[in-house]
Interface confidence: low
């Protein structure tokens, strides 16, 4: 067969589904290979092919889009399932085509089963929220496409196993799940039952997504060194290990990038010639307040790495800060014969 | 940042042709798709056609079919138009526009290339 | 082909007022895929907003767009002394793609 321009398996969209529920797939040629729509191509006289490989097995083969009921059907360039059946799982793929030009991607697609309480395999997306930031909404999400505007679904939620109801400060509203005040208590699965008719039948959506309760900005601060501080001093003889932690405090922030790194004399460690091994440790609060340390480690310290300066800095989206370390020579303990004997006057 | 630099104005005779190019700088050429536009004096917008450096097959206008010819050179990243059998009413600005990195729509426009009909 | 009707032609307007501009589309637009460009006097169109809505990368907030199938609207909210330009919508789900004829926003 002629060439085609294969962008291979795209693992990074690991499609998972419900079973006995509708999924509508997007050819991922437009979303993130080629970066024109389908109408582009559509219009330019390409023809967008479907075919599939069943799990377990190698050989590809067409899509039936000739089930009862429009089983699975194909619109522009999405790929329908009303609904998936658990033997769909396998990989697609979508091939743009004409005389001239050939390009192609396949896709994992999954379906899942899943509990009376919600639980299955399938990978959650996670909604942070800020704690007692005031009321904060969550969207049912990923339902978008599947009904037109006229159609008005019913939309059930729950927490875990249960229908959220008279429950104290989390209210469903349609689409939306509102938090009045956001706690730890709230952490957890939640999931929206999406309900619709179409053409005669009835389909439901399951999303479940996590909720976890993050630091609030309200409470956020620039990032607080713990150590170095005044209070020690790193004392060594030439020889000996050097051993400084800078341990860092940072305040949740979203899609803050929280850093820390040790200068020696204005200069990173990489790019000096002292034999220096720096380990990081990460630790998390329940709101995801983070603690780093970075542990600057010297095996046999000279007496000028000992006059050197050593700054640790810290910075998030709330700002920069830096502490030097105290470092020192150990002076000697007195030799009593020679100091002693100086002492009295002997020469 | 993706800039697309055209060539410079041309003045040229009825029954004649031109060729307008469109160099695309700074970014990733064949996957997006490079339209023409062209503005008569005074005048508003009208869409030529375009092509996808990575197709290579034109679409145009039925207006400009068989008098366009649009084309790319993806080692050069470079788009081209040619009209031919001109007349005095294609005396206009021609635009290159480039079809979408975060859209569908012409997000990235040429500076334009003046196109003068004279006897 | 899609014909888009711009209307009013001209809209005469002072600075800080609100301008309404309107686009009439002949079939309903695919996709909701129509734009809005600004061109000023010897400069290439502008992109403003795509996808009947979406503001582009850089525009101000003050440009809004409305509207679905036939009947689309853009909107400046307060008109600043660099929005008096010429305004096209385009609708770009169907080929031919096609403009209106344009509606220029001039100083009162």
């Known amino acids: 067969s002629e060439r085609c321009d294969d962008w291979g398996l795209d693992t990074m969209r690991q499609i998972q589904v419900f079973e006995d529920e509708p999924a509508r797939i997007k050819c991922p040629l437009f979303e993130h290979f080629l970066k024109f729509n389908y109408s582009t191509a559509h219009s330019a006289g390409l023809t967008l092919i479907w075919y599939w490989t069943r799990q377990d097995r190698d050989l590809e083969e067409p899509i039936n889009f000739r089930l009862p009921e429009n089983r699975i059907s194909k619109e522009k360039d999405v790929l329908w399932f009303r609904p998936t059946l658990l033997n769909d799982t396998g990989n697609y793929t979508c091939m743009l085509r004409n005389t001239t030009y050939c390009s192609k991607v396949a896709f994992p697609l999954e379906v899942v089963q899943k509990d009376s309480c919600f639980n299955s395999p399938m990978k959650l997306p996670v909604h942070k929220l800020y704690i007692e930031y005031g009321i904060q909404r969550i969207t049912c999400p990923n339902v978008d496409g599947y009904f037109p505007s006229s159609v008005k679904p019913t939309i059930t939620w729950y927490m875990g196993c249960y229908k959220i109801q008279n429950f104290n400060n989390v209210i469903p509203e349609g689409m939306n799940l509102s938090f009045l005040i956001a706690l730890i208590s709230n952490n957890g699965n939640y999931t929206c039952v999406v309900t619709y008719p179409e053409n005669g039948r009835t389909f439901h959506l399951t999303r479940t997504l996590t909720v976890k309760v993050v630091g609030s900005p309200k409470n956020a601060v620039p990032p607080v060194i713990h150590s170095p501080n005044d209070h020690v001093v790193y004392e060594k003889e030439p020889g000996e290990e050097l051993l400084i932690p800078c341990t860092v405090y940072f305040s949740f922030l979203m899609d803050s990038r929280n850093e820390v790194w040790w200068t020696i004399d204005g200069k990173k460690p990489d790019d000096i010639t002292i034999d220096v091994t720096i380990n990081e440790s990460i630790s998390h609060s329940r709101t995801e307040d983070e603690t780093r340390t970075q542990i600057l480690s010297i095996k046999k310290v000279t007496s000028e790495d000992l006059k050197r300066s050593y700054v640790c800095h810290a910075r998030s989206a709330k700002g920069e800060v830096a502490k030097a370390a105290k470092v020192k020579q150990k002076v000697p303990a007195p030799r009593y014969t020679v100091e002693l004997a100086c002492g009295f006057g002997a020469t | 940042q993706v800039q697309l630099l055209q060539s410079g104005a041309e003045v040229k005779k009825p029954g004649s042709s031109v060729k307008v190019s469109c160099k695309a700088s700074g970014g990733t050429f064949s996957i997006y798709a490079i339209d023409w536009v062209r503005q008569a004096p005074g005048q508003g917008l009208e869409w030529m056609g375009g092509?996808?450096?990575?197709?290579?097959?034109?679409n145009s206008a039925q207006k400009f079919q068989g008098r366009v010819t649009i084309t790319a050179d993806k080692s050069t990243s470079t788009a081209y138009m040619e009209l031919s059998s001109l007349r005095s009413e294609d005396t206009a600005v021609y635009y290159c526009?480039?079809?979408?990195?975060?859209?569908?729509?012409?997000?990235?426009w040429g500076q334009g290339t003046m196109v003068t009909v004279s006897s | 082909e899609i014909v888009l009707t711009q209307s009013p032609g001209t809209l005469s307007l002072s600075p800080g007022e609100r301008a309404t501009l309107s686009c009439r589309a002949s079939?309903?637009?695919?996709?909701?895929?129509l734009a809005w460009f600004q061109q000023r006097p010897g400069q290439a169109p502008r992109l403003l907003i795509y996808?009947?809505?979406r503001r582009a990368t850089g525009i101000p907030d003050r440009f809004s767009g409305s509207g679905s199938g036939t009947d689309f609207t853009l909107t400046i909210s307060r008109l600043e002394p660099e929005d008096f330009a010429v305004y096209y919508c385009?609708?770009?789900?169907?080929?031919?793609?096609?403009f209106g004829g344009g509606t220029k926003v001039e100083i009162k």
């Open positions: 092509i996808i450096p990575i197709f290579g097959t034109a």
């Open positions: 079939l309903s637009v695919s996709s909701n895929y």
């Open positions: 526009a480039r079809n979408g990195a975060t859209s569908d729509a012409f997000d990235m």
């Open positions: 385009q609708q770009y789900g169907s080929s031919p793609l096609t």
């Open positions: 996808g009947v809505s």
